[in-house]
């Protein structure tokens, strides 16, 4: 009886510790609003445990509900810079597969130089997340100012 | 065979439920930009389960990847207050041991009175996190306006 | 001996995967500052696994420490809109039972059009969370701009 109970418990590998924290690599060419990310211990404090990068975009490897978070700071920015070049907007969404394309999280900078937010969302294996920065302002590449990550929360 | 499978599973104590949510105690003397935190059920809704406070700074007790989050609101603040006393910046970082000193998260207030953000970061046992508020504005001590916390996420 | 060790492990159902992510349904009548939420796969990417909705407010079903997060964006808003109608404030709190009534998280919009934050807080079975938006501005109902969620973190 006690043995059967042990069988109900959760194997370590099924806990789905999938998690990633990325730093900005570069912006796209003019007509491409996507931010391109990079991660790995050689780069500092960024990492990928489960998800992968596909041409700078984050691809999910395990179905589940994820906490998605992001912070983007505009480079050498003041509130006048931000208002001068308004509207500058950041959107995080599933960009592929196309059939699942949707915006998950959207924020405008208005007179601020940083946006930061987070949300819970279901993601499926193969979903690729894109972060689109619309407007003409260059984001900061400082690793404590601009980052993007996901954390698997439950099946 | 089924017994061997049970052995792969995760012991409760290794789940590492380390978590802390702190409220502002006080600011430092003039030349010390650090915020000093406090936590515990006697104080309200703040708590420490695993991490500890060392002279108002948060010390980590378990290696792992943590979600670090913070919100700081400036006291009796309006957008004119904030812009008048610009730059006011909040930085969260590892301040000791000195060999691991690094800024993890940084935000400026610009014309706003509140900053809030979160990120995933690897932390090691013994890391002490400091939150530096640069500028001359006093932060609110209201527990729903200013708080700082960490949550262990995975090994 | 090894069998006893297996017994220390955590049954799946006690992991308490309670989690919810909600989208805005509607605002209350004039004298009611509460936001009314909705969730469920039929509505898009919102869901409730454990917690329930009670007349548009989120009710907790499991004791524990929760990560509470929220983002609210004001409808058709610019920084001038926001400053013109100041103060607009968002507060998340326990509104029932009355004996546990408390504000957990509070933010003002000032010259911005979006607030976003998160915090760890202990919640008990039966706690109902209310989100109060004071001021005269209407929040956006876009699901990527306004959302509210909780995630069970530990007992």
């Amino acid at each position: 009886q006690r043995f059967a109970q042990a069988q109900q418990q959760l194997p370590l590998e099924s806990l789905g510790w999938d998690v990633a924290e990325l730093q900005l690599n570069h912006t796209g060419p003019q007509q491409d609003p996507r931010l391109y990310w990079q991660g790995g211990p050689a780069l500092g404090r960024s990492f990928l445990h489960g998800p992968e990068l596909d041409k700078g975009q984050l691809r999910i490897h395990r179905d589940g509900i994820y906490m998605v978070h992001i912070q983007v700071t505009l480079a050498i920015c003041s509130s006048t810079t931000a208002s001068r070049h308004h509207p500058t907007t950041l959107a995080v969404g599933i960009c592929s597969p196309a059939s699942r394309s949707i915006s998950l999280l959207r924020l405008s900078f208005h007179q601020g130089c940083t946006i930061a937010s987070q949300r819970l969302t279901p993601l499926a294996r193969g979903d690729t997340l894109c972060t689109n920065l619309t407007g003409t302002l260059l984001p900061s590449r400082n690793t404590d100012e601009t980052f993007f990550g996901v954390q698997w929360v439950r099946p | 065979q089924r017994f061997a499978q049970a052995q792969q599973q995760l012991p409760l104590e290794s789940l590492g439920w380390d978590v802390a949510e702190l409220q502002l105690n006080h600011t430092g003397p003039q030349q010390d930009p650090r915020l000093y935190w406090q936590g515990g059920p006697a104080l309200g809704r703040s708590f420490l389960h695993g991490p500890e406070l060392d002279k108002g700074q948060l010390r980590i007790h378990r290696d792992g990847i943590y979600m670090v989050h913070i919100q700081v609101t400036l006291a009796i603040c309006s957008s004119t207050t904030a812009s008048r006393h610009h730059p006011t910046t909040l930085a969260v970082g590892i301040c000791s041991p000195a060999s691991r000193s690094i800024s993890l998260l940084r935000l400026s207030f610009h014309q706003g009175c509140t900053i809030a953000s979160q990120r995933l970061t690897p932390l090691a046992r013994g890391d002490t996190l400091c939150t530096n508020l640069t500028g001359t504005l006093l932060p609110s001590r209201n527990t729903d306006e200013t708080f700082f916390g960490v949550q262990w996420v995975r090994p | 001996q090894r069998f006893a060790q297996a017994q220390q492990q955590l049954p799946l159902e006690s992991l308490g995967w309670d989690v919810a992510e909600l989208q805005l349904n509607h605002t209350g009548p004039q004298q009611d500052p509460r936001l009314y939420w909705q969730g469920g796969p039929a509505l898009g990417r919102s869901f409730l696994h454990g917690p329930e909705l009670d007349k548009g407010q989120l009710r907790i079903h499991r004791d524990g420490i929760y990560m509470v997060h929220i983002q609210v964006t004001l409808a058709i808003c610019s920084s001038t809109t926001a400053s013109r109608h100041h103060p607009t404030t968002l507060a998340v709190g326990i509104c029932s039972p009355a004996s546990r009534s408390i504000s957990l998280l509070r933010l003002s919009f000032h010259q911005g059009c979006t607030i976003a934050s998160q915090r760890l807080t202990p919640l008990a079975r039966g706690d109902t969370l209310c989100t109060n938006l004071t001021g005269t501005l209407l929040p956006s109902r876009n699901t990527d701009e306004t959302f509210f969620g909780v995630q069970w973190v530990r007992p």
Partner: antibody
């Protein structure tokens, strides 16, 4: 293609004002900022000021009291006016477009320049 | 104001060789993970032409013979191999803060 065409006088009397019009094509003034720079043998290249896509301006503190930059988006024209010119204001005056990134102040397309001599 | 000092004031380089021009800023022009230093080429009777922005990014249409590097206060523009059409004056410009300032220029002559 992107072009900036300048028109303005070549000779200005001392203490008088200088007005130059920069007419742009191939891009919109509602998207890009336009800078003004002058070049003289004695002082090299000097940045004078900028008008941003939203119409606000920033000026070099050395010229702020006598410089004015404005624009008409619908006509794709930027207007430069400097008052109280003296002999040491003799230079070639350029308008130039800011690159795509609004917070990186570099100039990717330049007007042909207006050679201005201040003399009586 | 940030002062930019270019060196040498002039140099002569043989066809096919490397030309290296330096620019030193009176304070760091680094911010937000970038170096806010740009390079221009100006030929006689023409306006300046942008070659490099943000220290190392090649402007569209500029040959890969041109490259920029550096950070903080010290920057270099390299041209290799030098061609006859590269005879011009080269200027650095910072945009770390206002006012923008330019270096005094380096005149490149092809031997």
């Amino acid at each position: 293609q992107v072009q900036l065409q300048q028109s303005g006088p070549g000779l200005v009397q001392p203490s008088q004002s200088l007005s130059i019009t920069c007419t742009v094509s191939g891009f919109s003034l509602t998207t890009y900022a336009v800078h003004w720079v002058r070049q003289s043998p004695g002082k090299g290249l000097e940045w004078l000021g900028v008008i941003w896509s939203v119409g606000s301006t920033d000026y070099n503190a050395a010229f702020i009291s006598r410089l004015s930059i404005s624009k008409d988006n619908s006509k794709s024209q930027v207007f430069f006016k400097m008052n109280s010119l003296q002999a040491d204001d003799t230079a070639i005056y350029y308008c130039a477009r800011n690159i795509y990134y609004g917070n990186v102040y570099a100039m990717d397309y330049w007007g042909q320049g207006t050679s201005v001599t201040v003399s009586s | 104001d940030i002062v930019l000092t270019q060196s040498p004031a002039s140099l002569a380089v043989s066809l096919g060789q490397r030309a290296t021009i330096s620019c030193r800023a009176s304070k760091s022009v680094d911010a937000s993970g970038y170096s806010f230093m740009h390079w221009y080429q100006q030929k006689a009777g023409q306006p300046p032409k942008l070659l490099i922005y943000l220290a190392s990014n090649l402007e569209s249409g500029v040959p890969a013979r041109f490259s920029g590097r550096g950070s903080g206060t010290d920057f270099t523009l390299n041209i290799h191999p030098v061609e006859e059409g590269d005879a011009a004056t080269y200027y650095c410009q910072h945009s770390r803060e206002l006012p923008l300032t330019f270096g005094a220029g380096t005149k490149l002559e092809i031997k």
